[in-house]
């Protein structure tokens, strides 16, 4: 065509796949009458008529564009819907009068690829490979045009490097005309790359500008020989008996060698292999002081049969031995003194505490508890706690019962019990003393005795309420070798006029007696022996 070399560059129209391209015929009125225009698509320099405009009315020509073209803007613009990659070509409009002129439009089509999918080489890479090995593959699907790929290691872009880095990219065209890009990164890796993060980046263009998408970061298994093995103990810090302790072998090679853990026999000085779990971990649960000792780990490379030995590690399981208290079962008179001595062994410095068992009160900080001018109330439990202050939770205790000789001491002397005739009454009577008293009742019934502690006894009596019983009342008598003591239970009939018993009485029906009153400890400092009996 004469003068074609002087044709201006076509107007560029950019559009995304699936959207509508607006092809505006740029002929001026002088160049042609827009009410009489032919539209052509140009593919491989071949023109194909695709649309006619006559008297401002448009008509599609049969063919691939038949259903997708329409006229807009009073005939000046041709709209192409559902744009595909195959639509990337030149479109031209040709005016017929006054003379034949044409206007060219270059349609550029774009489609963002999907998120890049990265797959690491699952087999891993040995560090001593002679040539670059496949590290990972990056796939970017359904993009248009073909996106560019950039590989990164630890955030830095990788460039082709002879015998070290090679990037091999290929693409396939889908039936949709979209491209799928596949890029394989090959590299020679070193031991330090075991933690390296690799990812790929797809660079592509849209009508709005340049864009990029990044894959997730991956690490590749890197195989390298073991140079060193060592032991690791968990938990870190001071260990104590009862802890769960894990001893594991570690190596700086990948894959790790076959491990075995040995402990030195203190008698023979020989290393004896310990039994580990399926993960090669020696679990000491609960740890005991006997677990203390020298441990070492052997790593055997099953390929090369090279064996490596760790530095030995001393394990100390801190302990507190059984606590011994002397005297073990002290019996003392009122007014006498008692020295309780606590002993224990430990792998660390021990702290001793004496506590009153009943109250938890700390009486002494130290192994020796001295009790002077003992009163009956001093009888009971004393607990020695041997603890290691530097290791929280490491302690052992021993309870010792101090018996103070004395006749029976009644929990109450007198009590009123409200009853109904012919009911079965459950009465209780409590006494303490040393030797421990026995309790007898002055009425027939089913009695049972329960030892509350070494100095205290509780007797329970089930008895039928009869007129005779109401008259006589009930007495319980506690006795030991040092004396006798009696508690009296007055039985009173409940009747309609009995509303609230006076505040000094204890009410009760079928299970009548409330728990016995407790006697407050004497704080008297009078210089005399205690009362001969306590009547509750």
């Amino acid at each position: 065509v004469p003068g074609e070399a002087e044709q201006p560059a076509p107007e560029l129209v950019e559009v995304e796949v699936g959207s509508t391209a607006l092809l505006k015929c740029g002929l001026s009125q002088s160049q042609g009458n827009l009410s009489h225009v032919d539209w052509f698509s140009v593919h491989k320099e071949k023109r194909t008529l695709i649309f006619r405009v006559r008297q401002g009315q448009g008509q599609s020509e049969p063919g691939e564009y038949e259903q997708r073209l329409s006229l807009q803007d009073r005939g000046a613009t041709l709209a192409l819907t559902q744009v595909t990659p195959q639509d990337e070509r030149i479109f031209l409009c040709q005016g017929k009068r006054p003379r034949s002129q044409e206007y060219r439009i270059q349609l550029r089509v774009y489609k963002a690829p999907e998120e890049p999918n990265i797959q690491v080489n699952p087999l891993g890479i040995p560090v001593n490979s002679k040539e670059p090995e496949e590290v990972a593959t990056c796939v970017g699907r359904n993009g248009y045009p073909i996106p560019q790929v950039i590989w990164y290691k630890n955030g830095r872009p990788l460039k082709e490097e002879k015998n070290r880095v090679h990037i091999q990219s290929s693409q396939t065209v889908e039936s949709s005309g979209l491209y799928t890009l596949q890029s394989i990164l090959k590299a020679q890796l070193v031991k330090e790359d075991k933690d390296a993060q690799f990812y790929c980046e797809l660079n592509y263009r849209l009508p709005s500008g340049n864009h990029m998408k990044e894959s997730r970061e991956v690490t590749v298994p890197v195989f390298y020989p073991t140079e060193k093995v060592w032991l690791e103990v968990e938990p870190v810090g001071m260990l104590k008996e009862g802890d769960r302790v894990e001893i594991r072998c570690l190596a700086d090679g990948n894959p790790p060698p076959h491990f075995s853990i040995s402990k030195q026999n203190p008698s023979t000085r020989e290393a004896e292999e310990e039994t580990t779990n399926d993960n090669g971990v020696l679990v000491l649960e609960p740890a005991r002081k006997e677990h203390s000792g020298r441990y070492e780990c052997q790593g055997l490379d099953l390929d090369t049969m090279i064996s490596l030995l760790s530095e030995p590690q001393e394990l100390l399981v801190n302990y507190v031995s059984d606590v011994r208290v002397s005297p073990a079962a002290p019996e003392r008179q009122e007014g006498s003194s008692l020295t309780l001595t606590c002993e224990a062994e430990s792998s660390q410095d021990l702290e001793f505490q004496w506590l009153r068992e009943e109250t938890g009160q700390v009486l002494e900080r130290g192994p020796v508890l001295q009790l002077h001018d003992l009163k009956r109330e001093a009888g009971g439990g004393y607990r020695c706690v041997a603890s290691v202050p530097s290791i929280p939770g490491l302690n052992r205790t021993q309870l010792v019962n101090v018996a103070i000789f004395g006749p029976p001491w009644m929990a109450f002397k007198e009590r009123k019990v409200w009853v109904k005739e012919n009911m079965v009454l459950n009465l209780s009577c409590e006494a303490s003393g040393h030797p421990r008293p026995t309790i007898s009742w002055n009425v027939n019934g089913t009695a049972s005795e329960q030892d509350q502690d070494p100095q205290r006894v509780l007797s329970t009596l089930n008895v039928l309420v009869t007129p005779e019983l109401l008259e006589t009342g009930v007495e319980c008598t506690a006795s030991n070798d040092l004396g006798k003591n009696t508690s009296i239970l007055f039985l009173e009939l409940v009747n309609l006029t009995t509303l609230t018993p006076d505040s000094n009485t204890t009410t009760g029906l079928s299970t009548s007696t409330a728990s016995p009153h407790t006697r407050a400890n004497s704080t008297s400092t009078e210089r005399k022996l205690p009362e001969p009996e306590s009547r509750g």
């Epitope: 008179q333 007014g335 001018d373 000789f405 004395g406 022996l529």
Partner: antibody, heavy 119, light 109 residues
Framework: QVQLVESGGSLVQPGGSLRLSCEAS????????MSWVRQAPGKGLEWVSI????????SYADSVKGRFTISRDSSKNMLYLQMNSLRAEDTAVYYC????????????WGQGTLVTVSS | FMLTQDPAVSVALGQTVRITCQGD??????ASWYQQKPGQSPVLVIY???NRPSGIPDRFSGSSSGNTASLTITGAQAEDEADYYC?????????????FGTGTKLTVL
């Protein structure tokens, strides 16, 4: 074995003073209350005084209260009875006795020492 | 307070004899019993409910009822001839006092 040996008995004038001693051996002295018991010639036994194992508590029969003082030295395993303002009716053999429980009984007795109050 | 004993009791050799002791304190405390032979120190023979110190023959036994304590010798022997004293804590005072019984002279015939 348990042994109690009294000493210090003698003839003393009325109104005079005397100190009796009792040496204990064969047991943990500080763990036991100790008593003095006396027996006038041809008469029965009469309890005189008691002291607790620690020495912190004492008690006396009405007949000697205010005149006699009981004490002990556990470091020396010794029991003492300081007798002041002695009277003729204090004449007796004085025994020291160990109290088994602090509540009775007297399970070991010394051989006794004679105190005579006479002008 | 007082613990009262019979001044004298006699028993035929091999027979059983009971020596009694009465007093209010015996409602709360058991009596202890002591044997004293002429020129000797007293010896504990029974204490508590019915306990014998080692070395005391089992013919000696004790019992208690109400305000009365008893020492029983079953099959009395000649060597049992002695003075016998009961002893108890005083339950009337607010601090410990001990009291001895008046004593019983046992003669074995």
């Amino acid at each position: 074995q348990v042994q109690l040996v009294e000493s210090g008995g003698s003839l003393v004038q009325p109104g005079g003073s005397l100190r009796l001693s009792c040496e204990a051996s064969g047991f943990t002295f500080s763990s036991y209350a100790m008593s003095w018991v006396r027996q006038a010639p041809g008469k029965g036994l009469e309890w005189v005084s008691i002291i607790s194992g620690s020495g912190g508590s004492t008690s006396y029969a009405d007949s000697v209260k205010g005149r006699f003082t009981i004490s002990r030295d556990s470091s020396k395993n010794m029991l003492y009875l300081q007798m002041n303002s002695l009277r003729a009716e204090d004449t007796a053999v004085y025994y020291c006795a160990r109290d088994k429980y602090g509540y009775n009984p007297f399970d070991y007795w010394g051989q006794g020492t004679l105190v005579t109050v006479s002008s | 307070f007082m613990l009262t004993q019979d001044p004298a009791v006699s028993v035929a050799l091999g027979q059983t004899v009971r020596i009694t002791c009465q007093g209010d304190s015996l409602r709360s405390y058991y009596a202890s019993w002591y044997q004293q032979k002429p020129g000797q120190s007293p010896v504990l023979v029974i204490y508590g409910k019915n306990n014998r110190p080692s070395g005391i023959p089992d013919r000696f036994s004790g019992s208690s009822s109400g305000n009365t304590a008893s020492l029983t010798i079953t099959g009395a022997q000649a060597e049992d001839e002695a003075d016998y004293y009961c002893n108890s804590r005083d339950s009337s005072g607010n601090h410990p006092l001990y009291v001895f019984g008046t004593g019983t002279k046992l003669t074995v015939l």
